[in-house]
């Protein structure tokens, strides 16, 4: 069964910068990836980026850069302009549309240990590479 993984990281150097990593583990050709925050797109979530393998990417603030990491994984850099760092408690969702199998989605948030209030910066967790 295909799976989607989501990992949210806070940049160690800049506490206002976050990166969402998403990957698809399954067959078929990925046709579209939709990233949203605050819940799934269509269920109260707000669309942050749409990535198409051929037609490119489209993103909306506060998304800074959306890009393909591999044929089956993407990353989305976010710039948190607010001092309160709302991203820390936000859910990010990734939906992969793979033809002809269909769509799979998953959500994730910043691990509690990555709280910006902690003195030590978070240690980045190794990203699972779907292409290995």
């Amino acid at each position: 069964t295909p799976e989607v993984w989501v990992q949210v990281q806070m940049e160690a150097t800049e506490l206002s910068s976050f990166t969402v990593h998403c990957g698809f583990l399954g067959p078929g050709s990925i046709s579209l990836v939709t990233v949203s925050w605050g819940g799934p797109d269509g269920a109260g979530g707000t669309k942050l980026a749409v990535l198409h393998p051929e037609l490119g990417t489209r993103q909306w603030a506060p998304a800074r850069q959306a890009r393909w990491e591999t044929q089956s994984s993407i990353s989305l850099a976010l710039e948190d302009s607010g001092a309160s760092s709302p991203f820390a408690n936000t859910t990010f969702c990734c939906k992969f549309a793979s033809f002809p199998e269909g769509s799979w989605e998953s959500c994730g948030s910043l691990p509690p240990s990555s709280d910006p209030g902690l003195s030590a910066p978070p240690t980045p967790v190794p990203i699972l590479r779907a292409d290995l």
Epitope: G28, S29, S31, D41, G42, V50, F99, P100, G102
Partner: antibody, heavy 120, light 107 residues
């Protein structure tokens, strides 16, 4: 203007074979996933085959698996459906349709259909 | 396969009425639902995608809502030209499946 034109339908005997064609024009055919959808005499719509834009991935529901084969010729801008071991329940109007990635795989263009009647 | 149960099967309305069609999926289909209109003697035409997005040229009297398993399609102020069969479809998991259709007739 996007145009899909099906052909190849007709009257065929039980257990027989038929090959349907769908000529596409007005868009870059090789950039789109395509499907065959049939409409039964009771007017129900049913997906019978799907093929990815690169032609590497195909899908068939259990009702036609092993009997139908979908293929595409991007040089000729044509979609095909090879049907064999035809059953009476395959009697339907067969539509060729185009999937739009940005519309969540909704089918944004359909042909006019070609009729297939399986008789005993 | 995901079953899309569409109700009602028939609707007899007057021009100017408001019409609501519902579609229930046998499991969650996220927001991957489309609605089609099929006029007599024609092929189906896409009206709505991703539940609530109108396809090019579709009048704003057509609206859609829902998420997960329950979806609603509404025609505000029905017009004579809306005489057709309407189908919902899930494009979440293959095989893409359709509702049984709702035949809209104008009094």
């Amino acid at each position: 203007d996007v145009k899909l034109v099906e052909s190849g339908g007709g009257l065929v005997k039980l257990g027989g074979s038929l090959k349907l064609s769908c000529a596409a024009s007005g868009f870059t055919f090789s950039s789109y996933h395509m499907s065959w959808v049939r409409q039964t005499p009771e007017k129900r719509l049913e997906l019978v085959a799907a093929i990815s834009r690169d032609g590497d991935s195909t899908y068939y529901p259990d009702t036609v698996k092993g009997r139908f084969t979908i293929s595409r010729d991007d040089a000729e801008n044509t979609l095909y459906l090879q049907m064999s071991s035809l059953k009476s329940e395959d009697t339907a109007l067969y539509y060729c349709s185009r999937h739009e990635d940005y519309f969540g795989f909704a089918m944004d263009s359909w042909g006019q259909g070609t009729s297939v009647t399986v008789s005993s | 396969s995901i079953v899309m149960t569409q109700t009602p099967k028939f609707l007899l309305v007057s021009a100017g009425d408001r019409v609501t069609i519902t579609c229930k999926a046998s499991q969650s289909v996220s927001n991957d639902v489309a609605w089609y209109q099929q006029k007599p003697g024609q092929s189906p035409k896409l009206l709505m995608y991703y539940v609530s997005n109108r396809f090019t040229g579709v009048p704003d009297r057509f609206t859609g809502s829902g998420y997960g398993t329950d979806f609603t399609f509404t025609i505000n102020t029905v017009q004579a030209e809306d005489l057709a069969v309407y189908f919902c479809q899930q494009a979440y998991r293959s095989p893409w499946t359709f509702g049984g259709g709702t035949k809209l007739e104008i009094k």
